[in-house]
């Protein structure tokens, strides 16, 4: 397995522990969602990553101004996404780069599922079923 | 002891079986146990479900219903060492879409 596909709960520095919640969010399009990470904030800064599929490598999340916001209050870091869209679907990870070792640690990830009908075809199919 | 990443969620239709893997790198006879956390509720302690079945520690839930929803977490322990825990997989139970009223075979239609 690739190194990014495995993790352990290390007994090393406090930086090596990062807890993420929730594991899964399903919300309708247009709603606001929040995901949280708890870590030793003194150990290093937190950034957010995103990947669309389970088997992909996570990429740095490009924060959309006015719609996506990251905040941190001591040990608690929060990512807020407003007006969620279908293209927001995927798994979000918080990541901390340790100040002293420059090692990188990730949370377990939060999967976001945006509910509703994403295409005209899906909507038509639903109407056909209703008819 | 390494735990490999597991899917964040698994969608299973009502009445089907759910299979959860617990991939880890232990070559010894590791003890694999399964636990369930009610999503968003953070009950303590998590509900103990039992041991894993095969060498991979698989958990199978047969005939899934809505009450089975939640986060399924496996713990792997070698000897007296502290356990390692998977990130957990959220089980989503899907109600199959209702069959349309006019969903009949071609033979029936032509009668």
């Amino acid at each position: 397995a690739r190194s990014e596909d495995r993790y352990r709960n290390p007994k090393g520095s406090a930086c090596s522990r990062i807890w993420q919640s929730p594991r899964f969010i399903a919300r309708k399009r247009g709603f606001t969602v929040k995901m949280h990470c708890y870590m030793n904030s003194a150990s290093g800064n937190v950034s957010w990553l995103w990947k669309q599929e389970m088997d992909e490598n996570p990429q740095q999340l490009k924060l959309e101004k006015g719609r996506m916001e990251e905040s941190q209050n001591e040990s608690l870091a929060t990512l807020t996404i407003q007006g969620i869209r279908f293209e927001d679907n995927g798994i979000y990870f918080c990541q901390q780069k340790c100040n002293n070792t420059s090692e990188v640690y990730q949370g377990c990830g939060t999967e976001l599922r945006v509910m509703g009908f994403s295409t005209l075809a899906q909507l038509k199919q639903r109407n056909t079923l209703k008819d | 002891l390494w735990m490999h990443k597991v899917p964040a969620s698994l969608m299973v239709s009502l009445g089907e079986d759910a299979h959860f893997q617990c991939p880890h790198n232990s070559s010894n006879n590791a003890n694999v146990t399964w636990w369930r956390v009610l999503h968003g509720n953070y009950t303590w302690p998590p509900e103990f479900l039992g041991p894993g079945e095969d060498p991979n520690g698989t958990l199978i839930i047969q005939n899934v219903n809505k009450s089975h929803g939640g986060i399924y977490v496996c713990r792997v322990q070698e000897g007296n060492e502290s356990y390692q825990q998977s990130c957990g997989t959220y089980l989503r139970v899907r109600q199959p879409p209702p069959r349309p009223f006019l969903d009949m075979g071609e033979g029936t239609k032509n009668r």
């Epitope: 522990r17 | 956390v37 953070y42 303590w44």
Partner: nanobody, 116 residues
Framework: DVQLQESGGGLVQPGGSLSLSCAAS????????RAWHRQAPGKQRELVAA???????MYADSVKGRFTISRDNAKTLVSLQMDSLKPEDTAVYYC??????????WGQGTQVTVSS
């Protein structure tokens, strides 16, 4: 809102022990993280130890092997057993809890002084 109250602080000699407790004013909602932070004079507040809803723990390097965090579901939400105390452990210790929705609550703090 959940009101938190710490207790158990005091003056102790180097090498001694103390046990801190954190109680809630009302029955608290389900909690994701329960933690202890501390703030020494002239320094920033820092994480000491935390425990989550899975029972996993995290400790600051400086207290590993000396401090033990534990949780309870009754009125006492979280405790911190501090052994082999050192003068550098002198600080105000704060209880901190986080709900699954990310609401964060803090106690008023309890003073711990390690001095001979």
């Amino acid at each position: 809102d959940v009101q938190l109250q710490e207790s158990g602080g005091g003056l102790v000699q180097p090498g001694g022990s103390l046990s801190l407790s954190c109680a809630a004013s009302m029955s608290s909602p389900s909690l994701w993280v329960r933690a202890w932070h501390r703030q020494a004079p002239g320094k920033q507040r820092e994480l000491v130890a935390a425990i989550n809803s899975d029972g996993q723990t995290m400790y600051a390097d400086s207290v590993k092997g000396r401090f033990t965090i534990s949780r309870d579901n009754a009125k006492t939400l979280v405790s911190l057993q501090m052994d082999s105390l050192k003068p550098e452990d002198t600080a105000v210790y704060y209880c901190n809890v986080v709900t699954p929705r990310g609401q964060q609550y803090w106690g008023q703090g309890t003073q711990v002084t390690v001095s001979s």
